[in-house]
């Protein structure tokens, strides 16, 4: 039985993001509080009441505001989300008649893939490298004209929260590959994007 309706959101890094809570069954709160869930105890962010209006905690002053001022429906908006904003948030509707009724909405931050695709001849080998950096970690696949071509993949996590996946296609007879198209496929958040490369003899 859901007393508070919420929806999780996934938004792009450095863009605005909104989280909404709706108190059901025609109840109305006296005060609405938003908190960020933390490991030890939740952190108060902002409150709204008819008596005091919107009160934002100092740590969130330039980061958020309540953009739907209601005691039954409440929305907070982050102006410019960073990786630190990723997590779950509680909306607490304080009613004298029923106590504190809470809901949880989670915010996930994503970064669109940045992809590089290049090739390099070395003696009797041709190495084609496809690298994708994104959040959450992307997946890299190859579409090649023939089977049996080996590839190796390396994953690297960056301090900024993104992950680079680099896949190298090892072609032993590069002459056969000249003039042919190789496709690097990057899968991120359910979407596959093709990156094409035609090999020319250097």
């Amino acid at each position: 039985q859901v007393q508070v309706v919420t929806q999780d959101e996934r938004e792009q890094l450095y863009t605005p993001a909104s989280l909404k809570c709706s108190l059901q069954n025609a109840q109305e709160a006296l005060i609405v509080t938003w908190q960020k869930k933390k490991a030890v105890s939740p952190e108060n962010m902002v409150t709204f009441s008819e008596n005091h209006g919107v009160v934002i905690q100092p740590a969130y002053k330039d980061k958020i505001n309540i953009t739907q001022l209601g005691l039954q429906n409440s929305t907070i908006t982050f102006w410019n989300i960073t990786l630190e904003d990723e997590g779950c948030y509680m909306c607490l509707f304080n009613t004298f008649g029923f106590g504190k009724i809470s809901g949880t909405a989670c915010l996930t931050v994503y970064v669109q893939p940045i992809v590089s695709l290049h090739y390099k001849f070395s003696e009797d080998h041709l190495n084609i490298t496809c690298s994708a950096t994104a959040r959450p970690a992307p997946m890299v696949f190859w579409k090649v004209p023939r089977s049996g071509i080996e590839n190796s993949t390396v994953t690297l996590s960056h301090p900024n929260g993104t992950t680079s996946v680099t896949s190298i296609l090892h072609i032993k007879d590069p002459k056969n590959q000249v003039g042919k198209e190789v496709i690097c496929q990057v899968l991120h958040l359910g979407t596959v994007t093709d990156f094409k490369q035609t090999v020319n003899k250097g």
Epitope: I31, G97, G99
Partner: antibody
């Protein structure tokens, strides 16, 4: 003087429904949410749900969702609880109690005398 | 839901002697408004529950001052300084901070 007067005892058959009333007096009916509490024989108290008389909005304990329906009649300052599809485990004493919508101190401060419901064929 | 655990289950006390009942909650009952919605009720045999104490320690009008409530966060206590015959019955703690409101399992006070 604040009073919560509940309807009399009920003897009902399994599968039937029953509607219990809680008539209030001595205070402003719309200023208090009305709550209902179940007490099976020799057991503890169990919150069923509550209803806000201002708008008729009710909230329920998950366990009683579909079993109990809470309503109010503002004109007579009366709260009602209907119990449906009754079974032997619904045999209990049911209480109404008020809880303020505006004040800190009036939480479950006045209770009805209780209505005994016996489910038996 | 917040679980309210009362101990002991039964308390046998001689008239004139003190008594103490413990109530522990599974979550802190301190609300955002800095109030703690913890009540104590007494249910005498064949009667409705009667509120004795609200907001942890405030006595209802007409309740003798031999009853005292204390505690904070998750640990609460009801004390009777000198038990009298009219005190027998079942004592319940109740929390109204979190939805849904919940009661303790009850402590039966018997007179020795």
């Amino acid at each position: 003087e604040v009073q919560l007067q509940q309807s009399g005892p009920e003897l009902v058959k399994p599968g039937a429904s029953v509607k219990i009333s809680c008539k209030t007096s001595g205070y402003t009916f719309t200023e208090y949410t009305m709550h209902w509490v179940k007490q099976s024989h020799g057991k503890s108290l169990e919150w069923i749900g509550g209803v806000n008389p201002n708008n008729g909005g009710a909230l329920y304990n998950q366990k009683f969702k579909g079993k109990a329906t809470l309503t109010v009649d503002k004109s007579s300052s009366t709260a009602y609880m209907e119990l449906r599809s009754l079974a032997s485990e619904d045999s209990a004493v049911y209480y109404c109690a008020r809880r303020s919508n505006y004040r800190y101190d009036d939480a479950m401060d006045y209770w009805g005398q209780g209505t005994s419901v016996t489910v038996s064929s | 839901d917040v679980v309210m655990t009362q101990t002991p289950l039964t308390l046998s006390v001689t008239i004139g002697q003190p008594a103490s009942i413990s109530c522990k909650s599974s979550q802190s009952l301190l609300d955002i408004d800095e109030k703690t919605y913890l009540n104590w009720f007494l249910q005498r045999p064949g009667q409705s529950p009667k509120r004795l104490i609200y907001l942890v320690s405030k006595l209802d009008s007409g309740v003798p001052d031999r009853f005292t409530g204390s505690g904070s966060g998750t640990d609460f206590t009801l004390k009777i300084s000198r038990v009298e015959a009219e005190d027998l019955g079942v004592y319940y703690c109740w929390q109204g901070t979190h939805f849904p409101q919940t009661f303790g399992g009850g402590t039966k006070l018997e007179i020795k």
